[in-house]
Amino acid sequence: MMTGTIETTGNISAEKGGSIILQCHLSSTTAQVTQVNWEQQDQLLAICNADLGWHISPSFKDRVAPGPGLGLTLQSLTVNDTGEYFCIYHTYPDGTYTGRIFLEVLESSVAEHGARFQIP
């Protein structure tokens, strides 16, 4: 039975040109995490495999950095980075857990005036 839950940063915003850390945390399970995938809509950004380490998609290598931890750092943000991001935890023996984060990239002036999503 899958007892775990994924906690995420929820809905977040960041400034255009800035960076943001996407973080998920798996709790309430003793399952072993074997791999974490980070996806943007249907695009695979990066994988962290327990045995093989990190692999960043070459298409995103210049703007995506591994970590901290099992998280992912997005850099040089553009408005096109706005959208849904998913952390997919592969675990043994539970199976797959998925968390969702919505990122809105704002023009600097808007972000400076404090327009922010609340984390639920």
Partner: antibody, heavy 117, light 107 residues
Framework: EVQLQESGPGLVKPSETLSLTCAVS?????????WHWIRQPPGKGLEWIGF???????VYNPSLKGRVTISHDTSKNQFSLKLSSVTAADTAVYYC??????????WGQGTTVTVSS | DIQMTQSPSSLSASVGDRVTITCRTS??????LAWYQQKPGKVPKLLIY???TLAEGVPSRFSGSGSGTDFTLTISSLQPEDVATYYC?????????FGQGTKLEIK
């Protein structure tokens, strides 16, 4: 178009070190992907040896760990394999390959290495 | 290590036939399975990755399916140029391992 080409001695004596190089053209090995070595003994299946990342960190097959070293020279856009203390069981066609999320999308033509005295 | 078992080890089929090759893994690899084609005397060529995604330039008669521990490569209508040995490979952990191969011949 990305191309990989293996080179190195075709004959190695038992107990010596096998050394091979993979020259990459059409793509910079420091720009992403992983860079793998795979071998195929005569008439047999494929065995993965290990890889080097664009950053220079390496991952090896535990069955060969201690005997294998993979390195790269980004200035020459090539990466290399060294396999020490070889025996006849290391006789194989050795392939270099480009890895994307740990599958292999581009392969070299392969080079045959025979271990014999 | 994750063990990969392909079946059959060899098979003979006629042009136009539907051909199925299976690959079973010793533990759950989710969808992280690739298939390669190696023609006699040639280099292996990536056909499919992530169980069902066709590599660039691969004919649509090839397809993949499965998840967990059981996977299938299907050729919907066998062509003479499909004579080859086919290998499965998991891309999920260390060591990366291949199946022992399935040799496909034309009747």
């Amino acid at each position: 178009e990305v191309q990989l080409q293996e080179s190195g001695p075709g004959l190695v004596k038992p107990s010596e070190t096998l050394s091979l190089t993979c020259a990459v053209s059409g793509y910079s090995i420091s720009s992403g992907y992983d860079w793998h070595w795979i071998r195929q003994p005569p008439g047999k299946g494929l065995e993965w040896i290990g890889f080097i990342r664009d950053s220079g960190s390496t991952v090896y097959n535990p069955s060969l760990k201690g005997r294998v070293t993979i390195s790269h020279d980004t200035s020459k856009n090539q990466f290399s394999l060294k396999l020490s203390s070889v025996t006849a069981a290391d006789t194989a066609v050795y392939y270099c390959a480009r890895g994307l999320f740990w599958y292999f999308d581009v392969w070299g033509q392969g080079t045959t290495v025979t271990v014999s005295s | 290590d994750i063990q990969m078992t392909q079946s059959p080890s060899s098979l003979s089929a006629s042009v136009g036939d539907r051909v199925t090759i299976t690959c079973r893994t010793s533990e759950n690899i989710f969808s992280y399975l690739a298939w390669y084609q190696q023609k006699p005397g040639k280099v292996p060529k990536l056909l499919i990755y992530n169980t069902k995604t066709l590599a660039e330039g691969v004919p649509s008669r090839f397809s993949g399916s499965g998840s967990g521990t059981d996977f299938t490569l299907t050729i919907s209508s066998l062509q003479p140029e499909d004579v080859a040995t086919y290998y499965c490979q998991h891309h999920y952990g260390n060591p990366l391992t291949f199946g022992q191969g399935t040799k496909l011949e034309i009747k």
